[in-house]
Interface confidence: low
Amino acid sequence: IWELKKDVYVVELDWYPDAPGEMVVLTCDTPEEDGITWTLDQSSEVLGSGKTLTIQVKEFGDAGQYTCHKGGEVLSHSLLLLHKKEDGIWSTDILKDQKEPKNKTFLRCEAKNYSGRFTCWWLTTISTDLTFSVKSSRGSSDPQGVTCGAATLSAERVRGDNKEYEYSVECQEDSACPAAEESLPIEVMVDAVHKLKYENYTSSFFIRDIIKPDPPKNLQLKPLKNSRQVEVSWEYPDTWSTPHSYFSLTFCVQVQGKSKREKKDRVFTDKTSATVICRKNASISVRAQDRYYSSSWSEWASVPCS
Amino acid sequence: RAVPGGSSPAWTQCQQLSQKLCTLAWSAHPLVGHMDLREEGDEETTNDVPHIQCGDGCDPQGLRDNSQFCLQRIHQGLIFYEKLLGSDIFTGEPSLLPDSPVAQLHASLLGLSQLLQPEGHHWETQQIPSLSPSQPWQRLLLRFKILRSLQAFVAVAARVFAHGAATLSP
């Protein structure tokens, strides 16, 4: 058993039929010595008396809020949550496996630049009685600070018969050094509690590996005289790290016909303009990637040819 | 070339060669994004590589103030990786083809380090740890880790030279 936060405890249980469970001793937080009784949740049934209460925790029915009282007055509470271990593996019932980029990916994270700010998100089909707590650090043995904001519901989607909820959190490295080569990964830890079930999820990454720039901005076309060619120009996204002479992007320019089956023409360039042939009913798209490190491409910015 | 007394390197040449290094490092180990090498253990094997750290003056402001600190750090790293790529880890079994990207990478690391340091002038170089895994599969894993680490190193070096070429070239 360990303390998650004040008066909230997590009992780690091997979960199999007829498992013996875990013996837990609860102590009433009071100078009082006698006349103390214990109850569980909203029930008025007295579970025991005395300053300590010994219970055998085997299942969710044994978890909940234990309260000690004296003469009708509440003295203290202890909330017991269960963390299940099945076949040596901690349960992952609360969050959905996103399977990208690999199986058992519960947390996904992205950064728009090298400022040390990043966003992580996760999915669940649970809509109520759900809380998350997010902590992060750079490195684990001698951790350096990363401050995470609040995990908030960022999207709701219908997937077949199920509703899926996406939660996200923004974190910022306290003393980020955008120009340095990272040697220690960022660690993200998410505590999830659904009713009386506790689970934890972790992710470890370098900012450089989760970089995904925003799409190029101000995408414009300028027709060239007496030609089917156009000059496409664009700018670095506002959210990208500066100066751009240091934090450079490379770009992919694509001409795509109306039909998905039509051949795509692609040009790669480090410049912020390119000359392409604009076909009728086609569209021109541009996306960006870090010039020197192959992290994710941005989403496309598009403009019609006409 | 960076010469004693702190004159400027050939920023544009360094920029071109460092960008080529980035391309080669990724072609030598392109699937790196889909492999979480930290899960494989052997943390210590790549912990000894030189990293370009916050105080090394490789940020835009540090380069403007005095680029020599940063260039020295980059030079150390280039020599280190050049030695690693020429070591038993890469030359032993399973053997690489003579014209593999790793061979080109090795040559380019040497080329850039020579651009930064002409004959007769020596910055101190970091000792290369003795990494001689006995099993071929361990060697393979170690190659991946070294290339992964090299990709991050040359990305920072390329940013430095691109910025230098754009803002510090005479």
């Epitope: 936060k5 809509s127 009685d129 809380t131 707590s133 997010v134 995470c148 904001g149 995990a151 519901l153 | -």
Partner: antibody
């Protein structure tokens, strides 16, 4: 687009109670807290308390403890604020405001800003 | 309770001028818990800035927030006619959540 729509103006006698409603239209209640904030004529804003519509747990400012009751009906996406033992100084515009549900180094807590407000309900207490 | 003191109480400026509004807390407030609101007569408040420095959706770039600990600032770089209103800072660090008494920005 989500909107918070409040009930109409009320005139009440001192000592009586008033119950103001706040309905979320075009969205879900579940990911939000609903706070109640009041503003006396020509005065500043004063937070009264809030409710988590899913868990039903309400927090009240000490000043209003015992006089205010905040409730919510998730099925109709409506929150209610009832203020009892009214006095003339309770004359104010009462606003409901949404704050997204969040976590911060602890558990669910309404630490987010009030990003959506109702139009306000004027409650006049006069004999 | 955390007391937020805003200054000045009234700011008389002309369109195009820069407005600097101050909010001082009686005890330290994490910047993640500080917000600024704009209120016009007869209207509900509108969120401008949260996390001390982040602009809310649809808020023009002329509005910016800064500060940490006990001292926070809202800056309007160049006043537009529609910016003349009352501005409130708010902390959600501790319950009860509290607002400053407001700064009225009026046309000179």
């Amino acid at each position: 687009q989500v909107q918070l729509v409040q009930s109409g103006a009320e005139v009440k006698k001192p000592g009586s109670s008033v119950k103001v409603s706040c309905k979320a239209s075009g969205g879900t209640f579940s990911s939000n807290y609903i706070s109640w904030v009041r503003q006396a004529p020509g005065q500043g804003l004063e937070w009264m308390g809030l409710i988590d519509p899913v868990f039903g747990g309400a927090y009240y400012a000490q000043k209003f403890q015992g006089r205010v009751t905040i409730t919510a009906d998730e099925s109709t996406s409506t929150a209610y604020m009832e203020l009892s033992s009214l006095r003339s100084e309770d004359t104010a515009v009462y606003y409901c405001a949404r704050s997204k549900k969040g976590m911060y180094g602890g558990w669910t807590y309404p630490l987010m800003m009030f990003d959506l407000w109702g139009q306000g309900t004027l409650v006049t207490v006069s004999s | 309770d955390i007391v937020l003191t805003q200054s000045p109480a009234t700011l008389s400026l002309s369109p195009g001028e820069r407005a600097t509004l101050s909010c001082r807390a009686s005890q330290s407030v994490s910047s993640n818990y500080l917000a600024w609101y704009q209120q016009k007569p007869g209207q509900a408040p509108r969120l401008l800035i949260y996390y001390a420095s982040r602009r809310a959706t649809g808020v023009p770039a002329r509005f910016s927030g800064s500060g940490s600990g006990t001292d926070f600032t809202l800056t309007i770089s160049s006043l537009e006619p529609e910016d003349f209103a009352t501005y409130y800072c708010q902390q959600t660090s501790n319950t009860p959540f509290t607002f400053g008494q407001g700064t009225k920005v009026e046309i000179k």
